[in-house]
């Protein structure tokens, strides 16, 4: 931004500048250019020997300026366009200035003035241009400063040129008030802080409803000596509930929200939320819908899922395979997991209780992501009820549960009762029994044994009878032995695991049961 302190052309001849000597040399004249009257100070004493004609401006108040720019528009006639070349003719003039705290009026003293420069034209007006009224306008600019007094004068010294001053404009530069990155920077005088620091650092203030981002830098700009803003640093962002519209922050419209200070616009309230008011930072969930703590505010509100679909329990001897399908209503979420709980009831007494401790699951029964699980080690003659609950990220926000149950009765054989009949250093003779009523259902018995402490290998023997001798064993070694009935339906209940020890080579005949 240029702040004009003096503009001769704009004053349309109303500025009465001082000429010295009075009535000679410089002269205010009017001409017509482009059908418009223009005023100029001119002098053309090119055949009268040495000249020293001065033209001094009126006193110019400095205002806040430290450095001023002087723009001159002028025309100079070619000395060769005059007869005989006008021997004393010159084609330059001199520019001076003087600072003062008061206006000296008509008191003009050359010695008070300091020369700024000799002003020479880039283009002179030759005869043909003069006759055709082609004004060869030259533009020259000079900078003066730093200025310290209240005001100043400019002066033009003619030394024998044919020159016309059409425009004298004196101005200083300001970096204009500016909005940048939602920060307001004040109008700033363009000054060099020092020769090594030609930029003035100016702090901006965030516009209404804008803030400096957390951990970010406040807005800064640099004002150059040329009155231009450079190198923005930092920024302001519209605060929560407001979005950037041109150079301002505007409240989010009803039905929209913005949860944090950011560059992003307000977002439409997601599904299953209540319509927000103006300037909302979030949108409340509809009744029955919820947001998990980790859910972004831009996500739709969701609800717990419905119960799993089509739960089936398929009995396979002492095992049950549970299968189900995903809930019809996921609640709008993908993070569904399943939990399986088990209850067993004794048919004789009708007594029931949890059975988590006595059964084995093919994978941990809580936070299942698959839709099937196998439960083994079920006891015979027992009624089991399995509940499969579907849960998602918002299930913990409600007390109700979404589950489906399936019951199954275990009719498989009781576990065989096993005992050690005999033993030696290399063999163990094992016998077992089951109730007579169940014997018809047994197809074979499966005896599994291994050295205690050796989890990597085991041996299996099948037999139709109620006893087996396990040979080729190591002396003085404890073996883990389990007997399980095999029925048409699959595996029956297994006996508990027994520990039997072979005799040592010098050992006694004591037996461990």
């Amino acid at each position: 931004k240029e702040v004009v302190l003096l503009d001769f052309a704009a004053m349309k001849g109303e500025l009465g500048w001082l000429t010295h000597p009075y009535g000679k040399g410089w002269d205010l004249m009017q001409n017509i250019m482009d059908d418009m009257p223009i005023y100029m100070y001119s002098v053309c004493n090119v055949v009268s020997g040495d000249q020293d004609n001065w033209l001094r401006t009126n006193w110019v108040y400095r205002e806040e300026a430290e450095r001023i720019f002087i723009e001159l528009k002028f025309t100079v006639r070619d000395c060769n366009s005059f007869p005989g070349g006008a021997s004393s003719c010159k084609e330059t003039f001199n520019l001076y200035y003087a600072e003062s705290d008061v206006d000296y009026g008509t008191n003009f003293q050359k010695r008070q003035f300091t020369k700024i420069d000799t002003i020479a034209p880039d283009e002179i007006t030759v005869s043909s241009d003069f006759e055709a009224r082609n004004v060869k306008l030259n533009v020259e600019e000079r900078m003066v400063g730093p200025l310290t007094r209240k005001g100043f004068y400019l002066a033009f010294q003619d030394i024998g040129a044919c020159v016309a001053l059409l425009s004298v404009r004196v101005y200083y530069k300001k970096c204009p008030e500016m909005l940048q990155s939602l920060a307001r920077f004040p109008e700033t005088i363009a000054v060099a802080v020092s020769d090594t620091q030609p930029l003035a650092t100016v702090a901006g203030t965030c516009v209404d409803h804008a803030v400096v981002p957390y951990g970010g830098e406040g807005p800064l700009m640099h004002c150059t000596v040329d009155g231009e803003w450079l190198v923005p640093i930092g920024q302001c962002l519209c605060q929560e509930g407001y979005e950037k519209v041109e150079d301002a922050c505007r409240a989010c419209s009803p039905g929209f929200f913005k949860s944090e200070a950011s560059e992003s616009p307000c977002l439409e309230c997601p599904e299953h939320t209540l319509p927000s008011t103006e300037g909302a930072t979030s949108c409340q969930c509809e009744e029955g819908y919820f947001r998990a703590p980790e859910d972004p505010l831009s996500m739709s509100c969701t609800r717990p899922p419905s119960a799993p679909n089509y739960l089936t329990a398929i009995g396979m001897g002492a095992k049950v395979e549970l299968r189900w399908t995903a809930p019809k209503d996921t609640g709008g979420r993908q993070d569904i997991v399943y939990s399986v709980t088990c209850e067993q009831c004794w048919p004789e007494s009708g007594e029931c209780g949890p059975c988590e401790a006595s059964v084995r699951y093919s994978e941990p029964p809580h936070a299942l992501t698959r839709t099937s699980v196998t439960v083994s080690d079920l006891e015979p003659h027992m009624n089991y009820t399995f509940a499969v609950e579907a849960r998602n990220g918002v299930s913990g926000l409600v007390t109700s549960r979404s589950f489906r149950t399936a019951s199954v009765s275990i009719n498989q054989t009781e576990p065989p009762k096993v005992r050690l009949e005999d033993r030696s250093t290399t063999s163990l003779s094992v016998t077992w029994s089951i109730p007579v009523s169940q014997q018809s259902r047994v197809w074979k018995y499966e005896v599994t044994y291994r050295k205690k402490g050796d989890a990597n290998s085991y041996n299996v023997r099948r037999t139709e009878g109620f006893s087996v001798t396990l040979d080729d064993l190591a002396p003085d070694t404890t073996y883990l032995v389990q007997v399980q009935a095999l029925t048409q339906e699959g595996q029956g209940a297994g006996s508990k695991v027994h520990e039997f020890q072979t005799l040592s080579t010098e050992g006694s005949a004591n037996m461990a049961v």
Partner: antibody, heavy 128, light 107 residues
Framework: EVQLLESGGGLVQPGGSLRLSCAAS????????MAWVRQAPGKGLEWVSR????????HYADSVKGRFTISRDNSKNTLYLQMNSLRAEDTAVYYC?????????????????????WGQGTLVTVSS | DIQMTQSPSTLSASVGDRVTITCRAS??????LAWYQQKPGKAPKLLIY???NLHTGVPSRFSGSGSGTEFTLTISSLQPDDFATYYC?????????FGQGTKVEIK
């Protein structure tokens, strides 16, 4: 020394035509703006027409516009005024006048010109 | 067109007198004004241009002043050769109009 010598004047009937000539010497004719100025008997001066150093532009007074034509031949150092449809009010002494910008000690040319050099004039009489 | 009005139309003076002739323009012509001298049966002669600039070879007793609409031609000390008719001419517009003339005669 600058010399301008007009010729071609005389008596002519209204509606008739006449061609005036102005022979120039003692200066560089092609540098000069040239003009015709007339003076009716016992009256003041009236500018008639002008022509630029190279033959253009040309200007005319409203009273002669469309009837008179100014021209020049720089190779012959001669200025002309072709006068058609002459009227009684055109009766006057016609002066050839010249202007050289080199003698105009001003920084910017005036909107028009004045006349530095004059011929002795030639009389044109329009009468029936 | 710009009208130029001279006053007086006739002026009687004696040798050695200071003589002033006035020329008024119907609108501002800045300083674009010339003064001419004409003797009977002769061509006009240029005296002054741009209101105050003396033409080459013109005696310094002649001077011109003024700007805008009011102009004067001054003969500081009238000489026998100066008895003639004087015309002003504006060249601020293409019409280049002359004043009606001021006749300076012997008193």
């Amino acid at each position: 020394e600058v010399q301008l010598l007009e010729s071609g004047g005389g008596l002519v009937q209204p509606g008739g035509s006449l061609r005036l000539s102005c022979a120039a010497s003692g200066f560089t004719f092609s540098h000069y703006m040239m003009a015709w100025v007339r003076q009716a008997p016992g009256k003041g001066l009236e500018w008639v027409s002008r022509i630029g150093p190279s033959g253009g532009p040309t200007h005319y007074a409203d009273s002669v516009k469309g009837r008179f034509t100014i021209s020049r031949d720089n190779s012959k150092n001669t200025l002309y005024l072709q006068m058609n449809s002459l009227r009684a009010e055109d009766t006057a002494v016609y002066y050839c006048a010249g202007y050289d910008s080199g003698y105009d000690y001003v920084a910017v040319a005036g909107p028009a010109e004045y006349f530095q050099h004059w011929g002795q004039g030639t009389l044109v009489t329009v009468s029936s | 067109d710009i009208q130029m009005t001279q006053s007086p139309s006739t002026l009687s003076a004696s040798v050695g007198d200071r003589v002033t002739i006035t020329c008024r323009a119907s609108q501002s012509i800045s300083t674009w004004l010339a003064w001419y001298q004409q003797k009977p049966g002769k061509a006009p002669k240029l005296l002054i241009y741009k209101a105050s600039n003396l033409h080459t070879g013109v005696p310094s007793r002649f001077s011109g002043s003024g700007s805008g609409t009011e102009f004067t031609l001054t003969i500081s000390s009238l000489q026998p050769d100066d008895f003639a008719t004087y015309y002003c001419q504006q060249y601020n517009s293409y019409s280049r109009t002359f004043g009606q003339g001021t006749k300076v005669e012997i008193k």
